[in-house]
C-alpha cells in the first residue's frame, strides 16, 4: 500500500504479488464520513492504473478485477469524485507481477592460486522481476559446510572467501546455489570438485631472460611460480608477429632454454602455469617481458651497382651504390659499410669506411683494371664482402638487349620488356634494370635504382621510387662475365599533357635562317615522358594557320634551327611540348623579323 | 537495504520552474518504479508521478502536462522537472521505491510557490 490512508483503502487479493499471466481483484472502499458530503450516494470512486482510468462506481466501494499485467511494477490509485470538487486521491496500491526463478545453470567454482579463496559463478537464466535471493552452499569432508548469501538483484557471483588448502588434494567439496523470491524457488545441480580441479593458479612472475656470452643460441627464460606448479606453457613471438610461437614443458622449475630466436629481434614471451596434467586449469597468461635478443654478424652479400662517368682523358668518376642489408640479414645495427678498391694489376688497394651512406663516389685514372668489394658490418662483425669488376658496361654493342619497352602498369609500376641480344643470349649471366629520374642537366646526384633479373628473364616490373608524371631513364644492362651491353629507354608509370610550354629564350639569326633556343620544362611540369617538341609560327597580323615543326625530344637538345621563313616579314612564334597523352599550352611568343635578303 | 535522499526543493515564484533529484543506495532499485509524491499542509499524501525500470512515465492528471519524470539506473537517481509552478503546489516532496518487501521512502523536500 501507499501508506497508512486515512480516506479509505486499496486491497488486492489474492496477493500483491503475483504471477505472470494471473488475475487479481482490486477494492477500493471509502472508510465511514469520508465520502461526499451530504449525500453518499453521489460518491463517485474511479480506479487508474497509473493515469488511465480503468472503472467506476457510486457507492462506498468499488470491485475490480485485473488481468493481463505486464512484468514489474504497476500502480493503481484510487480517487473519489463528488460534484463541483475536483477528484481526490484516497489511497493506491502496487501490483508487483514476476516469475518463479529458473534454476541456475553452469555452476562452477574456482580459487585464484593456492592461497586465493573459493569463488562461483552460474548462470541465472531468464529475469524475474522480482527481488531474488541466491544462496551458495559449499559442503566438504568431515561434514564441514558453508554458506553465503547474495543481496545484489542480479546475482551470479559469490566468494565464499575460504581458502582450499592442499593437505588433501583429492577430497572431494560439493557446491549448490539457491535462487529464491516471493513466487519460489530453484537450485542448481550440484558441482563436485577437488582442489585440484579448482586451483588455478596465480599467472608466473618476475620473469627476466639470460643470454650467456651475449650470443641468441644460448638463451635461457626465468621465472618465479607458485609452489605447486607442475606444468608451463610459454609463448613468445616477435613483436611486430601476430603468431606465437608456442613450447609446453613439464616440471621447468623456473627455468627453459629458447634454442630458435633470431638474433636482434625484439620479442614477447609470456608464461602460463598449471597444476596437474588433466586437472584444474592453466593460469592467466603472465605479463609479457620483452627483450631484444643480441646481435651475430650479418650474413647474406649486399647487392653492389655501380656508374662510371669520364671526365677527361685520363681520369673516370665511379660512383657505388649498395643496398640495405634485410633486417634478418643485417642481424644487429650496421655501423658502417667498409668498401675496398684496388687496382688488380698493380695490386694497390684503398679501403674506406662509410657510415651514414649506402654510396660512394670516387676519381679513378682511366688506364688499369679495377675492382671493389662491399662489406656491412654490425658489433659482432661483417658480412662477407661483395666483389666486383669495374667494366666498361655497355661497351660489349652485341650484347645489348634489343627491343627494350617500358609501359605502365597500374598505379606508380613501369613493365620493362626486352628481346635477349644477339650475341649468343645463353652466354648472359643476368640483366640488371636500372632507372633514374630523368633531369635535363644530367644531375649525378639524382637516386639510382636497379634490380637484378635471372638471366632467363625478358622483363621486370619496377615499383621502387616510382612516382607518378615523372619521367624515368631506364636502361638494361646484360651482363656476362667481364663485358657488359645495354639499352635504353625513356617510361613513365602515369602521364598526362605537359603543364606548360617551353620558354624561348632567343631567336638569332644564320645566313638566312633562324635558330630558336630555349628553356626546358622545368621536371614537375613535365608530366611524364616528353615525345616532341613543336615550334609554332605565323605572320604577325595574319589570321592563317599557323605552320609547325615537330622536333624529336631529347634530353640535352635545346636550340632548333628554321629555314623557311621569309625575309622582312615579322613573324610571331611560340612552342609546346608533347607526352603520350597529349600537347601542353603555348609557351610564351616571340617576334622576330629575319633580315637577310629575299632569294 | 534502501536509502532515499530527496534534493532540489526551495522557493520559487508562481510560472517558475524547479528540478527535483532523488539518489537512492542500493542497486535493486533498478528494477522496481521509482515515484514522486506530495503531501501539501493538512492533506493526504498524494501521487505525482511514476517511471519505471524500463523508463515509461506517468503522471496523475494534476502533473500531465507540467511535470517531467526521468532516471539514471547507473547513478540510481530518478529526477522531477516541475516547470509552470503553482501556489497549489507547494508542498513536502517524497521519493518512493515500492518493492514487494515494503515501501521506501525518503525524507521529503519542502517546495514553496509564492503568487
Known amino acids: 500500500k501507499i501508506d497508512a490512508c486515512k480516506r479509505g483503502d486499496v486491497t488486492v487479493k489474492p496477493s500483491h504479488v503475483i504471477l505472470l499471466g494471473s488475475t487479481v481483484n482490486i477494492t477500493c472502499s471509502l472508510k465511514p464520513r469520508q465520502g461526499c458530503f451530504h449525500y453518499s450516494r453521489r460518491n463517485k470512486l474511479i480506479l487508474y492504473k497509473f493515469d488511465r482510468r480503468i472503472n467506476f462506481h457510486h457507492g462506498h466501494s468499488l470491485n475490480s478485477q485485473v488481468t493481463g499485467l505486464p512484468l514489474g511494477t504497476t500502480l493503481f490509485v484510487c480517487k473519489l469524485a463528488c460534484i463541483n470538487s475536483d477528484e481526490i486521491q484516497i489511497c493506491g496500491a502496487e501490483i508487483f507481477v514476476g516469475v518463479a526463478p529458473e534454476q541456475p545453470q553452469n555452476l562452477s567454482c574456482i580459487q585464484k592460486g593456492e592461497q586465493g579463496t573459493v569463488a562461483c559463478t552460474w548462470e541465472r537464466g531468464r529475469d524475474t522481476h522480482l527481488y531474488t535471493e541466491y544462496t551458495l552452499q559449499l559442503s566438504g569432508p568431515k561434514n564441514l559446510t558453508w554458506q553465503k548469501q547474495c543481496k545484489d538483484i542480479y546475482c551470479d557471483y559469490l566468494d565464499f572467501g575460504i581458502n582450499l588448502t592442499p593437505e588433501s588434494p583429492e577430497s572431494n567439496f560439493t557446491a549448490k546455489v539457491t535462487a529464491v523470491n516471493s513466487l519460489g524457488s530453484s537450485s542448481s545441480l550440484p558441482s563436485t570438485f577437488t582442489f585440484l580441479d579448482i586451483v588455478r593458479p596465480l599467472p608466473p612472475w618476475d620473469i627476466r631472460i639470460k643470454f650467456q656470452k651475449a650470443s641468441v643460441s644460448r638463451c635461457t627464460l626465468y621465472w618465479r611460480d607458485e609452489g605447486l606448479v607442475l606444468l608451463n606453457r610459454l609463448r613468445y613471438r616477435p613483436s611486430n608477429s601476430r603468431l606465437w610461437n608456442m613450447v609446453n614443458v613439464t616440471k621447468a622449475k623456473g627455468r627453459h632454454d629458447l634454442l630458435d630466436l633470431k638474433p636482434f629481434t625484439e620479442y614477447e614471451f609470456q608464461i602460463s602455469s598449471k597444476l596437474h596434467l588433466y586437472k584444474g586449469s592453466w593460469s592467466d597468461w603472465s605479463e609479457s617481458l620483452r627483450a631484444q635478443t643480441p646481435e651475430e654478424e650479418p650474413t647474406g652479400m649486399l647487392d653492389v651497382w655501380y656508374m662510371k662517368r669520364h671526365i677527361d682523358y685520363s681520369r673516370q668518376q665511379i660512383s657505388l651504390f649498395w643496398k640495405n642489408l634485410s633486417v634478418s640479414e643485417a642481424r644487429g645495427k650496421i655501423l658502417h659499410y667498409q668498401v675496398t678498391l684496388q687496382e688488380l694489376t698493380g695490386g694497390k688497394a684503398m679501403t674506406q669506411n662509410i657510415t651514414g651512406h649506402t654510396s660512394w663516389t670516387t676519381v679513378i685514372p682511366r688506364t688499369g683494371n679495377w675492382a671493389v668489394a662491399v662489406s656491412a658490418a654490425n658489433s659482432k662483425g661483417s658480412s662477407l664482402p661483395t666483389r666486383i669488376n669495374i667494366m666498361n658496361l655497355c661497351e660489349a654493342g652485341l650484347l645489348a638487349p634489343r627491343q627494350v619497352s617500358a609501359n605502365s602498369e597500374g598505379m606508380d609500376n613501369i613493365l620493362v620488356t626486352w628481346q635477349p641480344p644477339r650475341k649468343d643470349p645463353s652466354a648472359v649471366q643476368e640483366y640488371v634494370v636500372e632507372w633514374r629520374e630523368l633531369h635535363p642537366g644530367g644531375d649525378t646526384q639524382v637516386p639510382l635504382n636497379w634490380l637484378r633479373s635471372r638471366p632467363y628473364n625478358v622483363s621486370a616490373l619496377i615499383s621502387e621510387n616510382i612516382k607518378s608524371y615523372i619521367c624515368y631513364e631506364i636502361r638494361v644492362y646484360a651482363l656476362s662475365g667481364d663485358q657488359g651491353g645495354c639499352s635504353s629507354i625513356l617510361g613513365n608509370s602515369k602521364h598526362k599533357a605537359p603543364l606548360s610550354g617551353p620558354h624561348i629564350n632567343a631567336i638569332t639569326e644564320e645566313k638566312g635562317s633562324i635558330l630558336i633556343s630555349w628553356n626546358s620544362i622545368p621536371v614537375q611540369e613535365q608530366m611524364g615522358c616528353l615525345l616532341h617538341y613543336r615550334i609554332y609560327w605565323k605572320e604577325r597580323d595574319s589570321n592563317s594557320q599557323p605552320q609547325l615543326c615537330e622536333i624529336p625530344y631529347r634530353v640535352s637538345q635545346n636550340s632548333h634551327p628554321i629555314n623557311s621563313l621569309q625575309p622582312r616579314v615579322t613573324y610571331v612564334l611560340w612552342m609546346t611540348a608533347l607526352t603520350a597523352a597529349g600537347e601542353s599550352s603555348h609557351g610564351n611568343e616571340r617576334e622576330f623579323c629575319l633580315q637577310g635578303k629575299a632569294n | 537495504q534502501v536509502q532515499l535522499q530527496e534534493s532540489g526543493g526551495g522557493l520559487v515564484q508562481a510560472g517558475g520552474s524547479l528540478r527535483l533529484s532523488c539518489t537512492a543506495s542500493?542497486?535493486?532499485?533498478?528494477?522496481?518504479?521509482m515515484d514522486w509524491y506530495r503531501q501539501a499542509p493538512g492533506n493526504e499524501r498524494e501521487w505525482v508521478a511514476s517511471?519505471?525500470?524500463?523508463?515509461?512515465?506517468y503522471y496523475d492528471g494534476s502533473a500531465k502536462g507540467r511535470f517531467t519524470i526521468s532516471r539514471d539506473n547507473a547513478k540510481m537517481t530518478v529526477y522531477l522537472q516541475m516547470n509552470s509552478l503553482k501556489p497549489e503546489d507547494t508542498a513536502v516532496y517524497y521519493c518512493?521505491?515500492?518493492?514487494?518487501?515494503?515501501?521506501?521512502w525518503g525524507q521529503g523536500t519542502q517546495v514553496t510557490v509564492s503568487s
Open positions: 518512493k521505491v515500492p518493492t514487494e518487501k515494503g515501501n521506501y
Open positions: 542500493g542497486s535493486i532499485v533498478s528494477i522496481y518504479n
Open positions: 517511471i519505471t525500470s524500463s523508463g515509461d512515465p
